[in-house]
Interface confidence: medium
């Protein structure tokens, strides 16, 4: 799917829009809010009843080059006694983000936007039990 | 994830860093993944730390619709279906990259923007501070 052109009638294309070759778009990768402060809860990945670990994937031809992925530690959830309860399930929570992919074709370099699915953490759910007839 | 070796005959051998401004293809790779979390899973209802999903829409952004999670309870749901305040529901947050139209309203000119979204909630053991 192409990025939708704004179809709303109240959006008039301003004269100040930069000229862009057909089939492509101009992208400034100087990130807005690059230095915003994240106020995440403390150590939730280890205190959760569905704890998870983090791994960092690194790719020099991707921007940003580092993407952090979470993996649930258990199939079940941790109960009040600190034991795994397999009557409940730890499941991943995922979120899409955009990255810019650099592609080399011979001497030329092209750039492509890509949607990446990031596993952010895990939550504990009641399983869906299918009763077989 | 390895850089493809460049032909030594190529002019201006590529810098390891990305340029500040790039021209990118309008087609997005992997674009057809499901963007509505209500359709993709029912974890938000089945979790012991359930959450509501709120639609955040901004036509100057791509994607224009982002779903924000808000934990329903301060505590977590126990085996009896009641809220247990000895445990806490907390949001799991993630920084994501989106496209912001820049200059505003321009159809094919964007800038990357980092935004913080709450993706879901998880149940944690609280850190209890005993006040002296």
């Amino acid at each position: 799917r192409k990025i939708p052109k704004v179809g709303h009638t109240f959006f008039q294309k301003p004269e100040s829009c930069p000229p862009v070759p057909g089939g492509s778009m101009k992208l400034d990768i100087g990130i807005i809010n690059e230095n915003q402060r994240v106020s995440m809860s403390r150590n939730i990945e280890s205190r959760s009843t569905s704890p998870w670990n983090y791994t960092v994937t690194w790719d020099p031809n991707r921007y940003p080059s580092e993407v952090v992925q979470a993996q649930c530690r258990n199939l079940g959830c941790i109960n009040a006694q600190g034991k795994e309860d397999i009557s409940m399930n730890s499941v991943p929570i995922q979120q899409e983000t955009l990255v810019v992919r650099r592609k080399h074709q011979g001497c030329s370099v092209s750039f492509q936007l890509e949607k990446v699915l990031v596993t952010v953490g895990c939550t504990c759910v009641t399983p869906v039990i299918h009763h077989v007839q | 994830g390895i850089t493809i070796p460049r032909n030594p005959g190529c002019p201006n051998s590529e810098d390891k860093n990305f340029p500040r401004t790039v021209m990118v293809n309008l087609n997005i790779h992997n674009r057809n993944t499901n963007t509505n979390p209500k359709r993709s899973s029912d974890y938000y209802n089945r979790s012991t730390s359930p959450w509501n999903l709120h639609r955040n829409e901004d036509p100057e952004r791509y994607p224009s619709v982002i779903w924000e999670a808000k934990c329903r309870h301060l505590g977590c749901i126990n085996a009896d279906g009641n809220v247990d305040y000895h445990m806490n529901s907390v949001p799991i947050q993630q920084e994501i990259l989106v496209l912001r139209r820049e200059p505003p309203h321009c159809p094919n000119s964007f800038r990357l923007e980092k935004i913080l979204v709450s993706v879901g909630c998880t149940c944690v053991t609280p850190i209890v501070h005993h006040v002296a």
Epitope: S39 | K70, N88, V90, P91
Partner: nanobody, 123 residues
């Protein structure tokens, strides 16, 4: 980053009512658990209650459950405390507080606090 500013305090007669407001700045207000504490002269800071980010879940200190009502309006980035049947012992500085986690907030260890607003109950 969240900044909190309380308002609505003042002098009220015993048996009267008062509504305190807490205006929050910051785009992510709705992802925070927010609540109220109070501190009477010469006493420890006391937890009144808290409300979840969505507003669906409210937890009160048992002693104030019937007279105090906590609510929030995320569209206005505002937290409220409606107090009724006020008594002289309700005289205190009332503080608005916010944190990602109820556990921290409940035990007075929130990340963000307002400056407080004084409520005086006297005839």
């Amino acid at each position: 980053e969240v900044q909190l500013v309380e308002s609505g305090g003042g002098l009220v007669q015993p048996g009267g009512s008062l509504r305190l407001s807490c205006a929050a700045s910051g785009r992510t207000f709705s992802s925070y658990v927010v609540g109220w504490f109070r501190q009477a002269p010469g006493k420890e800071r006391e937890f009144i209650g808290a409300i979840s980010g969505s507003g669906d879940s409210i937890y009160y200190a048992v002693s104030e459950k019937d007279r105090f009502t906590i609510s929030r309006d995320n569209s206005k980035n505002t937290l409220y405390l409606q107090m009724s049947s006020l008594r002289p012992e309700d005289t205190a500085v009332y503080y608005c507080t916010a944190d990602q986690e109820f556990g921290y907030l409940r035990f007075g260890r929130s990340e963000y606090w307002g400056q407080g607003t004084l409520v005086t109950v006297s005839s």
